[in-house]
Interface confidence: medium
Amino acid sequence: MNGSEYFVKIQSFLGGAPTEDLKALSQQNVSMDLATFMKLRTDAVLPLTVAEVQKLLGPHVEGLKAEERHRPVRDWILRQRQDDLDTLGLGLQGGIPNGYLVLDLSMQEALSGTPCLLGP
């Protein structure tokens, strides 16, 4: 069974998938469509790297541009370094500016919804 066929079989169960499962899927050439990606738990999507999302979505990575204002894409963008987002070639804006240090202060993030940044 190839990656695409496997993805079809598990697609209906993916809404609640944890980050670890999404990371594993990104290595299996599944080409997750955007409709499915948009239904994923925000907290599961946030830790994914730009490279992992690109592998997870395959051709559908190009559609992130259309979803950049919607969750979970919007929140995921806020967590990525702008340099990394730029490598997607989609003009996605709102990432962490170059030279900033990200502090994983979960309480601060829980209150504000955004990571805590220290300037250069």
Epitope: S4, D86, G89
Partner: antibody, heavy 120, light 107 residues
Framework: EVQLVQSGAEVKKPGASVKVSCKAS????????MHWVRQAPGQRLEWMGN????????NYNEKFKNRVTITVDKSASTAYMELSSLRSEDTAVYYC?????????????WGQGTLVTVSS | DIVMTQTPLSLSVTPGQPASISCKAS??????IAWYQQKPGQSPQALIY???YRYSGVPDRFSGSGSGTDFTLKISRVEAEDVGVYYC?????????FGGGTKVEIK
């Protein structure tokens, strides 16, 4: 208005290479991947590959992987498709087309096409 | 690779009558399908994306339906300007692939 202007027709000998250009205007060139599709006489459309205009990264159809190179010149908003080791079966019209412009997937905009004739 | 199979190969339709083109994918592609019209000597023109959504400017006589592996393009009332070759395309996974085309002509 989105416009894609391709270079003119080419006649090449078997074994030679050809480089077709595609100048884009009317949208942010680095925000959308550029694809190349060809159509041999009486044949179906055939996807060759694409390029991320921001990073220069590309994906290729395995059928062409060792013969095709897709590049960009960001400063000129131009994409290039070079096909080497030409054979008669490569006689075709070659199109450039960005995918997913705005929020809609698919090839909504196409270049006018470049006819490449391979003949001894 | 995902193989897209179109039927029929050609279609001769009386103006004002409906026309229907089928496209079958060799594996599930969800609704990640687009339809194009190509007139002789011209670049393809996009009609439908995501299986059933019309691009702006496309007449409402064109409609698309289907999901999974079976898709249909319908023209409710064929007009003379609709002659050309129609292609389906999947963008579910690389390599992107097209159907073999259906030629529509007027009786």
């Amino acid at each position: 208005e989105v416009q894609l202007v391709q270079s003119g027709a080419e006649v090449k000998k078997p074994g030679a290479s050809v480089k077709v250009s595609c100048k884009a205007s009317g949208y942010t060139f680095t925000s959308y991947w550029m694809h190349w599709v060809r159509q041999a006489p009486g044949q179906r459309l055939e996807w060759m590959g694409n390029v991320n205009p921001s990073s220069g990264g590309s994906n290729y159809n395995e059928k062409f992987k060792n013969r095709v190179t897709i590049t960009v010149d960001k400063s000129a908003s131009t994409a290039y498709m070079e096909l080497s080791s030409l054979r008669s079966e490569d006689t075709a019209v070659y199109y450039c087309a960005p995918h997913y412009i705005g929020s809609r997937p698919g090839f909504a905009y196409w270049g006018q096409g470049t006819l490449v004739t391979v003949s001894s | 690779d995902i193989v897209m199979t179109q039927t029929p190969l050609s279609l001769s339709v009386t103006p004002g009558q409906p026309a229907s083109i089928s496209c079958k994918a060799s594996q599930n592609v969800g609704t990640n399908i687009a339809w194009y019209q190509q007139k002789p000597g011209q670049s393809p023109q996009a009609l439908i994306y995501s299986a059933s959504y019309r691009y702006s400017g496309v007449p409402d006589r064109f409609s698309g339906s289907g999901s999974g592996t079976d898709f249909t393009l319908k023209i409710s009332r064929v007009e003379a300007e609709d002659v050309g070759v129609y292609y389906c395309q999947q963008y579910n996974s690389y390599p992107l692939t097209f159907g073999g085309g259906t030629k529509v002509e007027i009786k």
